[in-house]
Interface confidence: medium
């Protein structure tokens, strides 16, 4: 039975040319995380595999950095980066958990950022 839940940074916005950290958090399960995929709509951005480490898709290598932690940092943002991003946690024995983040890249010099996770 899948007992875990995914928390995400939710809807976030950032300035054109800036950078943003995408974060998801899997909680309430002791399942082994074997791999985390980061996807933008139908494109694979990056994979973090427990045994093989990080792989960044070649087309995003210049603008995507792994981390912090299992998160993903997007750099040199353009308006075309606006859209849905998904973190896909592959776990054993639970299966797959998916979180969704919507990023809006703004032209203006003032962008309101989504709330960061609070640490207990």
């Amino acid at each position: 039975m899948m007992t875990g839940t995914i928390e995400t940074t939710g809807n976030i916005s950032a300035e054109k040319g800036g950078s943003i950290i995408l974060q998801c958090h899997l909680s309430s399960t002791t399942a082994q995380v074997t791999q985390v995929n980061w996807e933008q709509q139908d494109q694979l951005l990056a994979i973090c595999n427990a045994d093989l480490g990080w792989h960044i898709s070649p087309s995003f290598k210049d603008r995507v950095a792994p981390g912090p932690g299992l998160g993903l940092t997007l750099q040199s943002l353009t308006v075309n980066d606006t859209g849905e991003y998904f973190c896909i946690y592959h776990t054993y024995p639970d299966g797959t958990y998916t979180g969704r983040i919507f990023l809006e890249v703004l032209e203006s010099s003032v962008a309101e950022h989504g709330a960061r996770f609070q640490i207990p």
Epitope: E7, I21, Q23, C24, H25, L26, S27, S28, T30, Q32, V33, T34, C48, N49, A50, D51, L52, G53, W54, G67, P68, G69, L70, G71, R116, F117, I119
Partner: nanobody
Framework: EVQLVESGGGLVQPGGSLRLSCAAS??????MGWFRQAPGKEREWVAS???????WYADSVKGRFTISADNSKNTAYLQMNSLKPEDTAVYYC???????????WGQGTLVTVSS
């Protein structure tokens, strides 16, 4: 029940070294992380290690700290060299959920860097 127990903290002079250990019982995890919280500041991510031995670090500790894990002992380590006063904090190990959040935390071990 999952338990994470840190040890190895203490008082050290600037430029000195310490090795922290984090023993996991009840369940091992594919991703382990070290975090720290300085007085009056938010908890911050320090370093992570994957089951396969892959590691990554916060910029502030890169080149000075080394994270590792012994899967057979269910233990993660943080070797801290060239310590600075600004490294003073309570250090926590955690099951990685992301860069800043985890649902399994240890109780922390205090590292004080002072002359």
């Amino acid at each position: 029940e999952v338990q994470l127990v840190e040890s190895g903290g203490g008082l050290v002079q600037p430029g000195g070294s310490l090795r922290l250990s984090c023993a996991a019982s009840g369940r091992t995890f594919s991703f382990m992380g070290w975090f720290r919280q300085a007085p009056g500041k938010e908890r911050e991510w320090v370093a992570s290690v994957l089951r396969g031995g892959y590691t990554w670090y916060a910029d502030s500790v890169k080149g000075r700290f080394t994270i590792s894990a012994d899967n057979s002992k269910n233990t993660a380590y943080l070797q801290m060299n060239s310590l600075k006063p600004e490294d003073t904090a309570v250090y926590y190990c955690a099951r990685e959920g992301s860069g800043y959040a985890s649902d399994y935390w240890g109780q922390g071990t205090l590292v004080t860097v002072s002359s």
